[in-house]
Each structure stands twice: as structure tokens, then as C-alpha cells.
Amino acid sequence: ITRQSLDPQRRAAPQQKRSSPTEGLCPPGHHISEDSRECISCKYGQDYSTHWNDFLFCLRCTKCDSGEVEVNSCTTTRNTVCQCEEGTFREEDSPEICRKCRTGCPRGMVKVKDCTPWSDIECVHKES
């Protein structure tokens, strides 16, 4: 067994804000140190945590894909919110991609709902 330094963790990352865990957990915006003695703040714009936790790493901020716009930037307590660009929408079945909204309704149907970042246009049959 190799004998090493005692608790070097306590001296790590001095640039990050620290506090003490409560019942072994750290508040949103923080992660726990390796020796469970301190809560270390996540790095703004890089990572985050949303709940009380004992994470060794904060969660990495999402980067919006091309075809998406950033609605809310990442903070230490909230992930980035990305939205499909105008004219595209995200389907529940395939949330990883933004699909083009239809430009119009088939013959015999009328548009009742416009394209949104969450849904395609909605068409209903014309009343005869």
C-alpha cells in the first residue's frame, strides 16, 4: 500500500466558492468534494446541478444544436433551454431533431393552428 498525502482534496480548486454539506448533501448549483467536507460551486456557463445532491461532478451544460436557438442560457442551477428555430418543431417521438413544419394543409383541409417550436401546423377538414 502506498502512503500518500493526507486529504489533498481539501486544498483543491481554491477559485471555487465553497460551503458545508447539509446531511451529506450539497445545494443546487454545487457538487460535493471527495472528502464530503465541502460543497463546491458549479462553474457558471459550464456546468450545473438542479437539486440537493452528492455529485462528484456537476452536470455538463447542454449546447444547443444547429437548427436550435438558446432560449435560456445555462446557470449553475439550471441547464440550457434550447428551442427549435422558427419554422421547425420538435416531435415527442424524436426529440433529438427539429423537423420542418408543413407549409400548408392538404386540399379539403384548413389550418387551425400555426407551427410552434413544439408542434407542426394543425389541419382539420373543411366543414361542407
Epitope: 500518500q4 493526507l6 482534496q9 483543491a12 460535493i32 467536507r37 452528492d54 455529485f55 462528484l56
Partner: antibody, heavy 117, light 108 residues
């Protein structure tokens, strides 16, 4: 004095399972995050998995995700690595280590896992 | 993942000489989460340096670490016979934790 003692290694067939244990002493085990690091014969070091002091958070290398499970029993001062669906490329000496991100400041002597038919 | 590239792969030196080992990261790593280890054949690795420049307990002062961002260095000021071994750098800034491939310091 900090001591880490691994056990549970051995010869296993591809697709088989093995459970490694690491008995810890000389420090407040429940306070510290712990890791498993492996070394294939003649190769370098590869981090495998880590767990927080309470056991509430676990982390894995992509190469073992979904096949290996790290856990700990703080009442027994013991760290575990359950290895399922073993492959030839998992053949290595497995080290239990104290720490995760800042450094691995104490290491066990290692236990050899050989996956072969 | 952050890839750590160590150079040279092998360093052939004589006792008493200075050894300079390099560890280059594929993206910036926090100095707080950069460590160096020594490993001899048949033995577990041994922590030398943590936080890029802090010596672990019991490590002789001929070992020193420096660097920041993507470039880190381990220096052994005067090689002793027991220093001939393989040296690894390791980063813990982001998950997954990664090691360099190692630098072997051998007797010339």
C-alpha cells in the same frame, strides 16, 4: 495507516461475471469517494468507475457502462465492483483507489482478472 | 473526453541527470485536478504530485510539477536509481477521468 485490500479476481470465461471487493481501513471510509482503476497487461492506467462517499452518485467509463456496477457498504468499510458480461479486453489488474478527481492518494495492491475461454 | 498526451514515450537518462516529462491536454484542465503518479514493475502506482504542483506526503523535493491550461510538466531535478519507472499524468476536471499513456524513464 490507510490500507486498501482487493480480492475477488480470477479466471472467468467471456460473458461471465465476477465481483471484486476492496476492504478499507485507516480512514473514515464513509466520508470518501472511491474509485476502481485497471491496468491491462503491459498497458497504461484506465479509470473504470467511481462512487461518492454516501454511495448516492456513481460514475463509469464508457467501456464498462451497463456491464459493471460500483457499490459500497459503509458499515463494512468495503467497496465493490460487480462485473457482468465480461470480455477479453476486461483482462487487467484492478486497483481500488481512494479519491476520484483531485488524485488517487492511496492504492490497493491490485487483483488480477483474466477473461479467457 | 479529455485526452492527455505524454511525451516523450521513453526517456533514456543517467542517474544525476534532470528529467523533464510533458503532459498535454486536448482541452483546458483545472490545475486543481491534475496529478502525477510513479509506477514500478509489479507495484501499484504511487501519487507524486496533485493540484499540478503540490507534492504528496513523503515525496522528495527533487520531484516538482508545474503548468496550467493544457500544458503540464513533471521535473525530476536529479535522477536517483530508484526514480527509473513509468510516470503517468491524470486529470479529474471533467468526467470521464483520464490518464496519459505514460512516460518510461529508463537508465541510459
Amino acid at each position: 495507516e490507510v490500507q486498501l485490500l482487493e480480492s475477488g479476481g480470477g479466471l472467468v470465461q467471456p460473458g461471465g461475471s465476477l465481483r471484486l471487493s476492496c476492504a478499507a481501513s485507516g480512514f473514515t471510509f464513509s466520508s470518501y469517494a472511491m474509485s476502481w482503476v485497471r491496468q491491462a497487461p503491459g498497458k497504461g492506467l484506465e479509470w473504470v468507475s467511481a462512487i461518492s462517499g454516501s454511495g448516492g452518485s456513481t460514475y463509469y467509463a464508457d467501456s464498462v457502462k451497463g456491464r459493471f456496477t460500483i457499490s459500497r457498504d459503509n458499515s463494512k468499510n468495503t467497496l465493490y465492483l460487480q462485473m457482468n458480461s465480461l470480455r477479453a479486453e476486461d483482462t487487467a489488474v484492478y486497483y481500488c483507489a481512494k479519491g476520484v478527481r483531485v488524485s488517487f492518494d492511496y492504492w490497493g495492491q491490485g487483483t488480477l482478472v483474466t477473461v479467457s475461454s | 473526453e479529455i485526452v492527455l498526451t505524454q511525451s516523450p514515450g521513453t526517456l533514456s537518462l543517467s542517474p544525476g541527470e534532470r528529467a523533464t516529462l510533458s503532459c498535454r491536454a486536448s482541452q483546458s484542465v483545472s490545475s486543481s485536478y491534475l496529478a502525477w503518479y510513479q509506477q514500478k514493475p509489479g507495484q501499484a502506482p504511487r501519487l507524486l504530485i496533485y493540484g499540478a504542483s503540490s507534492r504528496a506526503t513523503g515525496i522528495p523535493d527533487r520531484f516538482s510539477g508545474s503548468g496550467s491550461g493544457t500544458d503540464f510538466t513533471l521535473t525530476i531535478s536529479r535522477l536517483e536509481p530508484e526514480d527509473f519507472a513509468v510516470y503517468y499524468c491524470q486529470q479529474g476536471t471533467t468526467h470521464p477521468i483520464t490518464f496519459g499513456q505514460g512516460t518510461k524513464v529508463e537508465i541510459k
